[in-house]
Amino acid sequence: QPSVSPGEPSPPSIHPGKSDLIVRVGDEIRLLCTDPGFVKWTFEILDETNENKQNEWITEKAEATNTGKYTCTNKHGLSNSIYVFVRDPAKLFLVDRSLYGKEDNDTLVRCPLTDPEVTNYSLKGCQGKPLPKDLRFIPDPKAGIMIKSVKRAYHRLCLHCSVDQEGKSVLSEKFILKVRPAFKAVPVVSVSKASYLLREGEEFTVTCTIKDVSSSVYSTWKRENSQTKLQEKYNSWHHGDFNYERQATLTISSARVNDSGVFMCYANNTFGSANVTTTLEVVDKGFINIFPMINTTVFVNDGENVDLIVEYEAFPKPEHQQWIYMNRTFTDKWEDYPKSENESNIRYVSELHLTRLKGTEGGTYTFLVSNSDVNAAIAFNVYVNTKPEILTYDRLVNGMLQCVAAGFPEPTIDWYFCPGTEQRCSASVLPVDVQTLNSSGPPFGKLVVQSSIDSSAFKHNGTVECKAYNDVGKTSAYFNFAFKGNNKEQIHPHTLFTP
C-alpha cells in the first residue's frame, strides 16, 4: 500500500492489498476501499465502465465478465487500483471484436484473459493459416495482444487470440483486422476542363476528380480570393481497398458575368495538400474576333498562287462561313477547321487558296463568319502584278507619237531615239504629255498609261523606242523614220518583247 508523509493527501487503500487478485467463477468478489474522502469505485474492462458509490464493492457470484480493473478514487482525485481475474475455464477470453489498425501504427487485439496463469498467450491465423511472417505482437493478459506496426497487407487478416490450457490450445472468437491506410503522398487531383467560356444565364458545371488511398481525404471547391461556400455535389467509388476516387462537381445553374474568375479544387490529407484550378469566363453575349494571318493588302504576280488565311475566335461556335469575290461565293478552293481538337477550343482557321491568278482576278476577297450572336467580316485587297502590255502605238495627225501601255503596278513609259542604224537606243526623249487613263475606282486591275512625244523634234533617220516597264517586266514598241527630201515618212511601227 502507498505511504505518504503526514499532512499531504494520500491515495485510498484497498483491501485485499495486492495489485492482482484471482477468484474462481461463482466466488464472491469483496473489495474494500478505505479513505476518509471516499468518492467512488470504478470498474473498467474493454470499453465498459461501471461505478459504485459504496466504499465496499461486493459481487456475490463472480462471472468472467467481472474480470477487470477496479479503481477507488478519493475527493482529492487520488486513486488506487486492483486488477481482478475471474477464472472461468469455459470463458478464457473477454473480447471486443472491433479491430481497426492504422497502417504503421500499433493496434490492440482486445482479448484480455480471465486467467493469468494460462500459457502461450499469442495470436493465431484462422483455419490454421499462418500469420504473416513480419507480424510482430506483444501479449498483455490485462489488455490483449498488441500488433506492432500494422501493414497494409494485413487488411482483412483473420485472427484468433490463443492460449494453452492443460496442454491444449484454446482459441478466442475470431477477429478481422481492418487496416486504415496511412497517407504517404498528397492526393491526386484533376479537373474536367482547365477553362470554361459561357454566356450569361448558361449553366457552369465543372468536375474535380480526387484520388487517394482512403475516403478520409478531404476535398472542396474554393473560389480564389473569396470565402463564399460553393454548392458542390460528391460522388465516390472504391476501386480497391486502398484506391478511392471522389468526384466533386461544382455547379452554378445560371452563370453571371461577375461569376468569372478562377476556381480551385483543393484536397488534403495528413501528408499534404494538392490543388488544381479552372478558369471561368462569362460574357454577356457571344463574340467573333478575326485575325488575318497575312497582310490584308496582297500583291501577287500574274500566274502565281496565293493563300488568304485568317484565324478567328468565335463563341458560341461558328455556324456559317463563306469567302466572297465580286458578289460571288466560293464553293470550293477554301477550307475551315478548328485550331485545336481541344473541347474548349474557340479558335478556328479559314484558308482561301487562289491559284494561277490572272491580271483580271485582282480585287476584294471577303471572309464572312457568323454565330448565333454576331456576324463578322474581313476583306483582303488582292493586286495582281502584270508585265506592261503596249496597247497602242501610233503617229497622230498632229505629228505626235503616242504610246499606250497597261500593267500593274502602273507602268512607266520612257522614250528613246536611235539615230541611223544603231541597235541601242540610249538618247532619252522627254514626253510632251503623260496620263493615267483609268484612275477612277479601286485600282485592282491593270493601270493604263498614255504617253506622247512630238515627232517634229526628230531631224534624222532613225528609230524611236517606246519602253513601258514596271516591277514585273518591260515591253517596247518602235517607230522607224526615214527622210525623203523634206518629207518625213513613218515606216510601220513594230514591237519587241523584252522579258
Epitope: 478520409s216 478531404y218 465516390s236 472504391h238 476501386h239
Partner: antibody, heavy 118, light 107 residues
Framework: EVQLLESGGGLVQPGGSLRLSCAAS????????MSWVRQAPGKGLEWVSL????????YYADSVKGRFTISRDNSKNTLYLQMNSLRAEDTAVYYC???????????WGQGTLVTVSS | DIQMTQSPSSLSASVGDRVTITCRAS??????LNWYQQKPGKAPKLLIY???TLESGVPSRFSGSGSGTDFTLTISSLQPEDFATYYC?????????FGGGTKVEIK
C-alpha cells in the same frame, strides 16, 4: 462497446422540418464515416446520406438531395440529419450507421421513427 | 445510380436447409457488396462485407461469393435464429444502394 443512439423523430406536417441526432460512444468517432439509412413501414432499406470522418465531404441519395443536410460534431460524438421540406414519402424509421464503402456498415442504432402527415 | 436486384423476394425453408440468395447489380461493382440480416423491429446487422469477408461474431454457416455483377449469400445449414430478412448493398459507388430484400420464412 460501440453504441449508436438516435433521437429527434416524431410527427411533422408536410413541408415541415425535423433534426435527427445520433449519439455515438465506444469508439473514436472522428475516425469513422457515418451514414443515415431509412426504412419506410413494411419496405426495404434505403441509404440516405453519408458524411466523412472529418465532416468535410457529404453524399446524398437523389431523393433527399437539396432537402436534407448531414453534419457531425466530433467534439460531441454526435451525428445529425437536418430534414427540411418533408414529404409523406419521407415517413420511415431512420437509422444511423457506422462505416464506409470498404468495410460495410458494421454498427447500427436502434432507429427513430419520423412520420410526415397532415 | 447502381440498381441492386435481389432474388427471390421471399422463400420458405426448414431448419438444416441450405439456402442461397442472389443479388445482381446493374453494373460491375468489383468486390464492394455487403449482406445484412434484419429481424422484425430490429436494426440491420452486418453479416458479410467485401463480398466474402465474414464480420466478426457472425457464424461460419454464412458465406458470400461472386464478383462483377452477380453475388450470392449462402446459409449452409439454416438455424432457427436465421429466419429474417436479408439485404444486399453495394458500396462501390455513391449513392450506396440496397437490394429489395429477401424474406426467409419457416416452411
Amino acid at each position: 462497446e460501440v453504441q449508436l443512439l438516435e433521437s429527434g423523430g416524431g410527427l411533422v406536417q408536410p413541408g415541415g422540418s425535423l433534426r435527427l441526432s445520433c449519439a455515438a460512444s465506444g469508439f473514436t468517432f472522428g475516425n469513422f464515416a457515418m451514414s443515415w439509412v431509412r426504412q419506410a413501414p413494411g419496405k426495404g432499406l434505403e441509404w440516405v446520406s453519408l458524411i466523412s470522418g472529418s465532416g468535410g465531404n457529404t453524399y446524398y441519395a437523389d431523393s433527399v438531395k437539396g432537402r436534407f443536410t448531414i453534419s457531425r460534431d466530433n467534439s460531441k460524438n454526435t451525428l445529425y440529419l437536418q430534414m427540411n421540406s418533408l414529404r409523406a414519402e419521407d415517413t420511415a424509421v431512420y437509422y444511423c450507421a457506422r462505416g464506409d464503402g470498404v468495410n460495410g456498415f458494421d454498427y447500427w442504432g436502434q432507429g427513430t421513427l419520423v412520420t410526415v402527415s397532415s | 445510380d447502381i440498381q441492386m436486384t435481389q432474388s427471390p423476394s421471399s422463400l420458405s425453408a426448414s431448419v438444416g436447409d441450405r439456402v442461397t440468395i442472389t443479388c445482381r447489380a446493374s453494373q460491375s461493382i468489383p468486390t464492394y457488396l455487403n449482406w445484412y440480416q434484419q429481424k422484425p423491429g430490429k436494426a440491420p446487422k452486418l453479416l458479410i462485407y467485401a463480398t466474402s469477408t465474414l464480420e466478426s461474431g457472425v457464424p461460419s454457416r454464412f458465406s458470400g461469393s461472386g464478383s462483377g455483377t452477380d453475388f450470392t449469400l449462402t446459409i449452409s445449414s439454416l438455424q432457427p435464429e436465421d429466419f429474417a430478412t436479408y439485404y444486399c448493398q453495394q458500396t462501390y459507388s455513391t449513392p450506396y444502394t440496397f437490394g429489395g430484400g429477401t424474406k426467409v420464412e419457416i416452411k
